[in-house]
């Protein structure tokens, strides 16, 4: 019985539960998903049952070995996996156990401008960038190309400062998880400071 | 890469016996069990046997008890299959094939084959 | 010994054709059936293995279906690749393991 093993996986993708085993005559092997049996092999026997027929398709097992592939993920096959190998030439059986996170695809994300202010010509706002459908695990960073140097900050909320008359910023917000990533659409300075840039001192959403 | 590679054909007198060699690569030899089908010309597939190179266990299917001796040597991840008493009716082709782990009757790699010709 | 009985022993087909290979186990084997093509001079190679279990590689439009004693192989809609014989294995508990006699797949 080895450490838990954390895997990954991405909604209507698969995922490989690894398993070896050097043991000569395993009478059965049981996969369990949160305490569900999921499948149960008896390899001599030339036998795999699925318990549940919808899992049916989805399950398969690379080049022949003890390895479950599970396909066709969804967001609730997150969750604890547990194998159980038995074997009459083993006292106890060997198990290994899995954590699976199953993660969407990211869409776009979406950026938001907080109140800005325009004094003596300088535009100062945040922006803020999240996901629309509160997906989980995401990180945030923040692109701003144009200067002399481009940089990089990390966090769902930029801080800007942009003077009038310098050279036009792009900023652009990178959404990651696990499995993908994903860009806002670019956002120029100058085009986010003109509404402001009438009254040098006004604030607007 | 899985690989089975078989000894050349092999042309012998009846009440000769053959040897025939079934040499193993890409995989933990010694962990999977090797069985020995063979074809008669023109017929289909027949199951002699197979062992467990582990351990040198090995099982014959009961027409070849006696004149089918099945081994393995692990230091070379080779496995053998000798046959006696040879006779007209044991010209085939000889396959060598690995088991699967999760169906262990089942087998996934097989070897080129090597045609045995008994012949007065 | 298990016998398994394999029908048709040939049958002519076309590029695009359904086909459908039947095996008959003379007793219950659950699942424990395996299918596999060969080509003239070639060995064979394995297709489906526990009744439904396409092995790796595989194209899906060979599918395995049954259990107890009836057994079907199915090629979805049959390629120039295809033409080649087809056998039947059980390998259901302890040995001896049997084939069925075969199903040559022929161009009509």
């Known amino acids: 019985s080895g450490p838990v093993k954390e895997l990954v996986g991405s909604v209507g993708g698969a995922v490989t539960f690894p398993l070896k085993s050097k043991v000569k005559q395993v009478d059965s092997i049981v996969w369990t998903f949160n305490t569900t049996p999921l499948v149960t092999i008896q390899p001599e026997g030339g036998t795999i049952i699925v318990t549940q027929n919808r899992n049916r398709e989805r399950v398969d097992f690379p080049d022949g070995g003890y390895s479950l592939k599970l396909s066709k993920l969804k967001k609730n096959d997150s969750g604890i996996y547990y194998v159980g190998i038995y074997s009459s030439s083993l006292q106890q059986p060997s198990t290994q156990e899995y954590v699976l996170h199953v993660y969407e695809h990211l869409s776009k994300p979406k950026v938001t401008m907080g109140l800005q202010s325009n004094k003596n010509g300088t535009c100062v706002t945040n922006l803020t960038c999240c996901m629309e459908h509160g997906e989980e695990d995401v990180i945030y960073t923040w692109k701003a190309l144009g200067q002399a140097a481009n940089e990089s900050h990390n966090g769902s909320i930029l801080p800007i400062s942009w003077r009038w008359g310098e050279s036009d910023m792009t900023f652009i917000c990178v959404a990651r998880n696990p499995v993908s990533r994903n860009f806002s659409s670019p956002i120029l300075a100058r085009k986010l400071c003109e509404g402001a840039a009438d009254d040098p001192d006004s604030s607007m959403v | 890469q899985v690989q089975l590679v078989q000894s050349g054909a092999e042309v012998k007198k009846p009440g000769a016996s053959v040897k025939v060699s079934c040499k193993a690569s890409?995989?933990?030899?010694?962990?999977?069990?090797m069985n020995w089908v063979r074809q008669a010309p023109g017929q289909g597939l027949e199951w002699m046997g197979r062992?467990?190179?582990?351990?040198?266990?090995?099982k014959y299917q009961g027409k070849f008890k006696g004149k089918v001796t099945l081994t393995a040597d692990k230091s070379t991840s080779t496995a053998y299959m000798e046959l006696s008493s040879l006779r007209s009716e044991d010209t085939a082709v000889y396959y060598c094939?690995?088991?699967?782990?999760?169906?262990?009757?089942?087998?996934?790699?097989w070897g080129q084959g090597t045609l045995v010709t008994v012949s007065s | 010994d298990i016998q398994m009985t394999q029908s048709p022993s040939s049958l002519s087909a076309s590029v695009g054709d359904r086909v459908t290979i039947t095996c008959k186990a003379s007793?219950?084997?659950?699942?424990?059936v395996a299918w596999y093509q060969q080509k003239p001079g070639k060995a064979p190679k394995l297709l489906i293995y526990?009744?439904?279990y396409r092995y790796t590689g595989v194209p899906s439009r060979f599918s395995g279906s049954g259990s107890g004693t009836d057994f079907t192989l199915t090629i979805s809609s049959l390629q120039p690749e295809d033409f080649a014989t087809y056998y039947c294995?059980?390998?259901?508990?302890?040995?001896?393991?049997?084939f069925g006699g075969g199903t040559k797949v022929e161009i009509k």
């Open positions: 094939a690995r088991s699967t782990m999760i169906a262990t009757g089942a087998m996934d790699y």
């Open positions: 890409g995989y933990t030899f010694s962990s999977s069990w």
């Open positions: 062992i467990y190179p582990g351990d040198a266990d090995a």
């Open positions: 007793q219950d084997v659950s699942t424990a």
């Open positions: 526990s009744a439904s």
């Open positions: 294995q059980q390998h259901y508990s302890t040995p001896p393991y049997t």
